[in-house]
Interface confidence: low
């Protein structure tokens, strides 16, 4: 038997975020009754339920996400103060009745780098460049010193060789 049908709409299937942001995992659904909406999270090690609710009734939020998630009647959820460990696939399932459900997935990528970190990165690279310039300068100075030292050494060797030849000539 066909079911009366649930349509699930996910406007954005991948979201990039930075730490400490509040992120809206946006969906919308169409069905004839009041469905059950469930969100699960799949980090590397398994599947974890976040929240389950029927629109218009209080949400059953898991301990791991208590005070960190807000639900909306259109099926969307908002995650507050995300961290890198919140990265992963979020699976939403809208169930009208057994045998009539739709699921969808949103990939959330949370990165450490925030906009204020770019200043630090710039300063870091500037320091690296300065150190590189200093090192190159030192190498150039060392190279010059070594060159002069080698010239002096060659000159001394030349003098001593000349003296030896002269002495041999005298002996003869």
């Amino acid at each position: 038997l066909q079911s009366q049908g649930v349509s699930l709409y996910i406007p954005q299937s991948a979201i990039n975020a930075t730490v400490q942001q509040d992120i809206l995992l946006s969906v919308d659904y169409i069905c004839h009754g009041v469905p059950t909406i469930e969100w699960k999270y799949t980090p590397n090690w398994g599947v974890q339920r976040i929240v389950e609710w029927k629109p218009g009734t209080p949400a059953n939020v898991s301990q791991s996400h208590r005070d960190r998630v807000c639900t909306f009647d259109n099926g969307s959820i908002q995650l507050f103060n995300v961290s890198v460990k919140d990265s992963g696939y979020y699976i939403v399932t809208v169930t009208e009745h057994p045998g009539s459900s739709q699921s969808g997935t949103i990939l959330l990528r949370v990165s450490e780098i925030r906009y204020e970190d770019l200043h630090f990165v710039a300063v870091f690279f500037a320091l690296l460049a300065a150190v590189a310039v200093v090192l190159i300068s030192l190498m150039w100075v060392c190279n010059q010193c070594a060159y002069k030292f080698q010239r002096k050494r060659r000159y001394k060797l030349k003098e001593s060789t000349t003296e030896e030849i002269e002495m041999k000539e005298v002996e003869c």
Epitope: L1, Q4, G5, S7, Y9, D28, I30, H32
Partner: antibody, heavy 121, light 112 residues
Framework: EVQLVESGGGLVQPGRSLRLSCAAS????????MHWVRQAPGKGLEWVAV????????YYADSVKGRFTISRDNSKNTLYLQMNSLRAEDTAVYYC??????????????WGQGTLVTVSS | QPVLTQSSSASASLGASVKLTCSLS???????IAWHQQQPEKGPRYLMK???????SKGDGIPDRFSGSSSGAERYLTISSLQSEDEADYYC?????????FGGGTKLTVLG
């Protein structure tokens, strides 16, 4: 008391455009999906289009797809139907109807009184 | 897409009862429907939503004389103690994923 009042109907030539409006009152308009349903003279009811509570989801009957556009202005509690490339077979009384739920495509618990659109040369 | 089939007309005497039928197409017998009434020269009026198990929820101000029931793919609207104002067209309607479907309507005549 829930009230839905349609307006904008009239006589229009084939190929021309018309915009219908539906003014809603007596309920939280921004919380419900809304529909347009039409009835040709002496015929049965035919669903035309639905729009979800926030305007993000829209569905159309095959007979009007690509020609009609449903929209809403929640700040004005008003539903619209923009009808382009009108044909003689679009002649009907157009009703707006309130859905029982927010994202729609269920059933209508309130109807307007309708506005007549006549497409004729 | 579901198809709804209604008989085009029905009649019953004033004060009597009448049972209108709406049949769902094959494969759609689990669908809920709605019944709407349209009195002459008026807009439609929502009567009730009727589930496959026979449970139903009526619209505001709908008298107890109107009731719904289900059997398989059949959905029924029973009107008891018929009154003259019950003379109207009755439409069943259902819905799916982004679609809406109406039956052809049944014209109910209340006899004398």
């Amino acid at each position: 008391e829930v009230q839905l009042v349609e307006s904008g109907g009239g006589l229009v030539q084939p190929g021309r455009s018309l915009r219908l409006s539906c003014a809603a009152s007596g309920f939280t308009f921004s919380s419900y999906a809304m529909h347009w349903v039409r009835q040709a003279p002496g015929k049965g009811l035919e669903w035309v289009a639905v729009i979800s509570y926030d305007g993000s989801n829209k569905y159309y009957a095959d007979s009007v797809k690509g020609r009609f556009t449903i929209s809403r202005d929640n700040s004005k509690n008003t539903l619209y139907l923009q009808m382009n490339s009108l044909r003689a077979e679009d002649t009907a009384v157009y009703y707006c109807a309130k859905d029982q739920y927010s994202v729609g495509a269920t059933t209508y618990d309130y109807w307007g009184q309708g506005t007549l659109v006549t497409v004729s040369s | 897409q579901p198809v709804l089939t209604q008989s085009s007309s029905a009649s019953a005497s004033l004060g009597a009862s009448v049972k209108l039928t709406c049949s769902l197409s094959s494969g759609h017998s689990s669908y809920a429907i709605a019944w709407h009434q349209q009195q002459p020269e008026k807009g439609p009026r929502y009567l009730m939503k009727l589930n496959s198990d026979g449970s139903h929820s009526k619209g505001d101000g709908i008298p107890d004389r109107f009731s719904g029931s289900s059997s398989g793919a059949e959905r029924y609207l029973t009107i008891s103690s018929l009154q003259s104002e019950d003379e109207a067209d009755y439409y069943c309607q259902t819905w799916g994923s982004g679609i809406q479907v109406f039956g052809g309507g049944t014209k109910l005549t209340v006899l004398g």
